[in-house]
Interface confidence: low
């Protein structure tokens, strides 16, 4: 079928269109183009005869048309009037006529649009604004963009006049945006320049900054006022209702208590004619005094006295705070605060309560700290310690003993030998001692402030012969694979060599054995049951030697996995069952039995007379060592057969 395709269908003014013929029959005489939907001689554009290959213009020919041998028609420099239908009349060789009609539409190339507005400075919540997209163009579609986005859905936005007019009702400051309109037709699309909507608004209620309303005397007051407003607001300040100045900022240097009052910022928008005010109340406080601490007892005695610390001065409606050692008060039944927190009482002071203590006065702006106060707690003397710890000395050496007792104030010391006062010094020195210097050496420490005295007595033996040593132990019953044991050879003596023997032999080399403290201490790490031996220590010097009595180490171990005897597991009916359980353990373990999980008796031996097949089952022996806290067990299966059914069965005990 003969068809006409318009390329393009929508044609811009000034451009060209090709009316392209499809399915043109063969063997043609000629063809002719007409303007309109039918063949009309008055509206012929051009005719073409195949034979002569000659084109003949018709009444509707404009000089802009070109016909091609394939019957297609090109129309150049299109004008608006070219819009419409075009008919091709084909005359075949047999003079049979065929017609086909095509069409195209002509649209103008759109100019760049512009936006006109009925109100260049609308007032928020009051005015409406109508934007109109210019020029008015036929067959054009109008589109609107806000901040380069398509129009949001809003009851305040209304399109009218074929979308050419955009009306914003009751404008708000948020409508301050970039508005563009776009005109479209099938052949072009043009966008306008942006129009920025300038919405007049405000002033909103002004905000005064900073928000701080409390100041100290002597500070500068610098208040700034801001109210959202377009155009920017004009500002005025009033203090207690009296006009001050027409500025956005109010600055008053070196304020005093007299500057307290109500500060009003008034914002005015000359375009909207609106005023808004905000009031802030400023309070100026006089500088509070620096606090200090008084005490009812400057030298309290440990475990006897209480101390009351008071924060001065007393100020009404003030919060008092306390710190001990730069930290807030710990929870302690010995610390008590008065109702107003001004007095801190320490009940039954200890030497650890020295402090420092600080109190603080909190006002509206900050906390003022007192200087720290340290308590002078009187304590002691504690039991004095005499050093060195040697108790045996050889004749001819110098004896130098020093005494020390924790005390505040420091203790005064006295030495007594066999109850006789010697001297009032911290150190006792006797040169070139003899056996006559043996005796009881007493150090007496005295605290003159508390009136307390404490003594320590040390027995000093001066002898060329060494005494018989003894062994002390830090653990009399160590647990195997768990504990360490430290043996110490007593006494500690000057210029003495210490030796050790195990089972009469010198010490074996072992990473678990360690000598220390001048060989006076022997440590066994991770003891085992094999360490349960006789240990002897010896002391010797250039004139004598001596050995201690042996000390046997009692190592707690076990229980090991028990063994049930006899080993038999098959028995004949009627025999006696006599099972004995044994486990290596120190001390001896406690034994118990279970048959098929049911507890039986707490004995080492389980005896059942005249067993039957009913006695078949699992026999478990449980062992427990209360000293090591360890347990163990073993299970044995017993089978009882009827008499004579199987050879080789045990007859029982």
């Amino acid at each position: 079928k003969l068809t006409i395709e318009s390329t393009p269908f929508n044609v811009a003014e000034g451009k060209e269109v090709l009316l392209l013929v499809h399915n043109l029959p063969q063997h043609l005489f000629g063809y002719s183009w007409y303007k309109g939907e039918r063949v009309d001689g008055n509206r012929q554009i051009i005719g073409y005869v195949i034979g002569t290959q000659q084109a003949t213009p018709g009444p509707a020919y404009s000089g802009r048309e070109i016909i091609y041998p394939n019957a297609s028609l090109l129309i150049q420099n299109i004008i608006q009037n070219d819009t419409g239908f075009y008919t091709l009349h084909v005359i075949k060789s047999d003079l049979v006529n065929e017609e086909a009609t095509g069409q195209f539409r002509v649209y103008p190339e759109l100019p760049k649009p512009s936006i006109s507005s009925n109100n260049s400075k609308p007032v928020e919540d009051k005015d409406a604004v109508a934007f109109t997209c210019e020029p008015e163009t036929q067959d054009a579609t109008y589109l609107w963009w806000v901040n380069n986005q398509s129009l949001p859905v809003s009851p305040r936005l209304q399109l009218s006049n074929g979308n050419r007019t955009l009306t914003l009702f009751n404008v708000t400051r948020n409508d301050t945006a970039s508005y563009k309109c776009e005109t479209q037709n099938p052949v072009s699309a043009r966008r306008s320049d942006s129009v920025i909507l300038n919405v007049l608004y405000g002033p909103d209620a002004p905000t005064i900054s900073p928000l701080n309303t409390s100041y100290r005397s002597g500070e500068n007051l610098n208040l700034s006022c801001h109210a959202a407003s377009n155009p920017p607001a004009q500002y005025s300040w009033f203090v207690n209702g009296t006009f001050q100045q027409s500025t956005q900022e109010l600055f008053i240097p070196n304020i005093t208590v007299n500057n307290s009052g109500s500060y009003t910022c008034q914002a005015h928008n000359s375009d909207t004619g609106l005023n808004r005010t905000t009031v802030t109340t400023i309070t100026v406080y006089a500088e509070p005094p620096k606090p200090f601490i008084t005490s009812n007892n400057s030298n309290p005695v440990e475990d006897e006295d209480a101390v009351a610390l008071t924060c001065e001065p007393e100020i009404q409606n003030t919060t008092y705070l306390w710190w001990v050692n730069n930290q807030s008060l710990p929870v302690s039944p010995r610390l008590q605060l008065s109702n107003d927190n001004r007095t801190l009482t320490l009940l039954s002071v200890t030497r650890n309560d020295v402090g420092p203590y600080e109190c603080g006065i909190q006002n509206e702006l900050s906390v003022d700290h007192s200087d720290p106060v340290i308590l002078n707690v009187l304590y002691g003397p504690d039991d004095p310690t005499i050093s060195p710890s040697y108790t045996y000395y050889r004749p001819g050496v110098n004896l130098s003993l020093s005494c020390h007792a924790a005390s505040n104030p420091p203790a005064q010391y006295s030495w007594l030998i066999d109850g006789n006062i010697q001297q009032h010094t911290q150190e006792l020195f006797i040169s070139n001692i003899t056996e006559k210097n043996s005796g009881l050496y007493t150090c007496q420490a005295n605290n003159s402030a508390s009136g307390h005295s404490r003594t320590t007595v040390k027995t000093i033996t001066v002898s060329a012969e060494l005494p018989k040593p003894s062994i002390s132990s830090n653990n009399s019953k160590p647990v195997e694979d768990k504990d360490a044991v430290a043996f110490t050879c007593e006494p500690e003596a000057q210029n003495t060599t210490y030796l050790w023997w195990v089972n009469g032999q010198s010490l074996p080399v072992s990473p678990r054995l360690q000598l220390s403290n001048g060989n006076r201490t022997l440590t066994l790490f991770n003891v085992t049951r094999n360490d349960a031996r006789a240990y002897v220590c010896g002391i010797q010097n250039s004139v004598s030697a001596n050995r201690s009595d042996p000390v046997t180490l009692d190592v707690l171990y076990g229980p090991d996995t028990p063994i049930i005897s006899p080993p038999d597991s098959s028995y004949l009916s009627g025999a006696n069952l006599n099972l004995s359980c044994h486990s290596a353990s120190n001390p001896s373990p406690q034994y118990s039995w279970r048959i098929n999980g049911i507890p039986q008796q707490h004995t080492q031996v389980l005896f059942i007379a005249k067993i039957t097949p009913n006695n078949n089952g699992t026999y478990a022996c449980f062992v427990s060592n209360l000293a090591t806290g360890r347990n163990n067990s073993i299970v044995k299966s017993i089978t009882v057969s009827a008499s004579g059914t199987s050879p080789g069965l045990s007859a029982g005990a």
Epitope: T242, F243, Q245, S246, N275
Partner: antibody
Framework: QVQLVQSGAEVKKPGSSVKVSCKAS????????ISWVRQAPGQGLEWMGH????????GYAQKFQGRVTITADESTSTAYMELSSLRSEDTAVYYC??????????WGQGTLVTVSS | DIQMTQSPSSLSASVGDRVTITCRAS??????LNWYQQKPGKAPKLLIY???SLQSGVPSRFSGSGSGTDFTLTISSLQPEDFATYYC?????????FGQGTKLEIK
């Protein structure tokens, strides 16, 4: 258009007081301040004080402190200026005027106060 | 208080003349200055506000300039109705003060 209408001329004896009124119309009475300015015969303008009608707060020039009282009645949109302990040098035309963000923009017609024994 | 000093205190000029009146503040008042015109027996009338803004209804031959401490009122072409006394007034401080006035007389 704002209009400020003042009370009529007064003749006062020295030591007495005078109270001049100023009624506002055609605008919002409380959206500014009412100032009082006087002008002695053949002299310049002299600011005396003002009142903010919205809260009744007044401010006075140091020269008149203690002698002048400025008040306002919002219900009648009227401001008042009372000057006490009058002396002959207080003879002047007293103006009320509206201050609104950029100085005084509207003035009353003036009230002549004559102080004479 | 801020003192305002006008100069000259009096001035003779003819119709059509260009006239300039100056006002000086004792301290900076930014642009918080107004100019008023007063004719005998009348209340003052606002001409210029905020140093340079022309009040509505005032002829454009009046103009104001300046900021800080020095200000000027200019009448570009004097008209017969312009002969009057002119005052400057500061409103930087809430204690408003006026200049002593400049009397403009016909020559």
């Amino acid at each position: 258009q704002v209009q400020l209408v003042q009370s009529g001329a007064e003749v006062k004896k020295p030591g007495s007081s005078v109270k001049v009124s100023c009624k506002a119309s055609g605008g919002t009475f409380h959206d500014g301040a009412i100032s009082w300015v006087r002008q002695a015969p053949g002299q310049g303008l002299e600011w005396m004080g003002h009142i903010i009608p919205i809260d009744g707060t007044a401010g006075y020039a140091q020269k008149f402190q203690g002698r002048v009282t400025i008040t306002a009645d919002e219900s009648t949109s009227t401001a008042y200026m009372e000057l006490s302990s009058l002396r002959s040098e207080d003879t002047a035309v007293y103006y009320c005027a509206r201050y609104r963000f950029y100085g005084i923009d509207y003035w009353g017609q003036g009230t002549l106060v004559t102080v004479s024994s | 208080d801020i003192q305002m000093t006008q100069s000259p205190s009096s001035l003779s000029a003819s119709v059509g003349d260009r006239v300039t009146i100056t006002c000086r503040a004792s301290q900076s008042i930014s642009s918080y200055l107004n100019w008023y015109q007063q004719k005998p027996g009348k209340a003052p009338k606002l001409l210029i506000y905020a140093a340079s803004s022309l009040q509505s209804g005032v002829p454009s031959r009046f103009s104001g300039s300046g900021s800080g401490t020095d200000f000027t009122l200019t009448i570009s072409s004097l008209q017969p109705e312009d002969f009057a006394t002119y005052y400057c007034q500061q409103w930087r401080s809430h204690l408003f003060t006026f200049g002593q006035g400049t009397k403009l007389e016909i020559k």
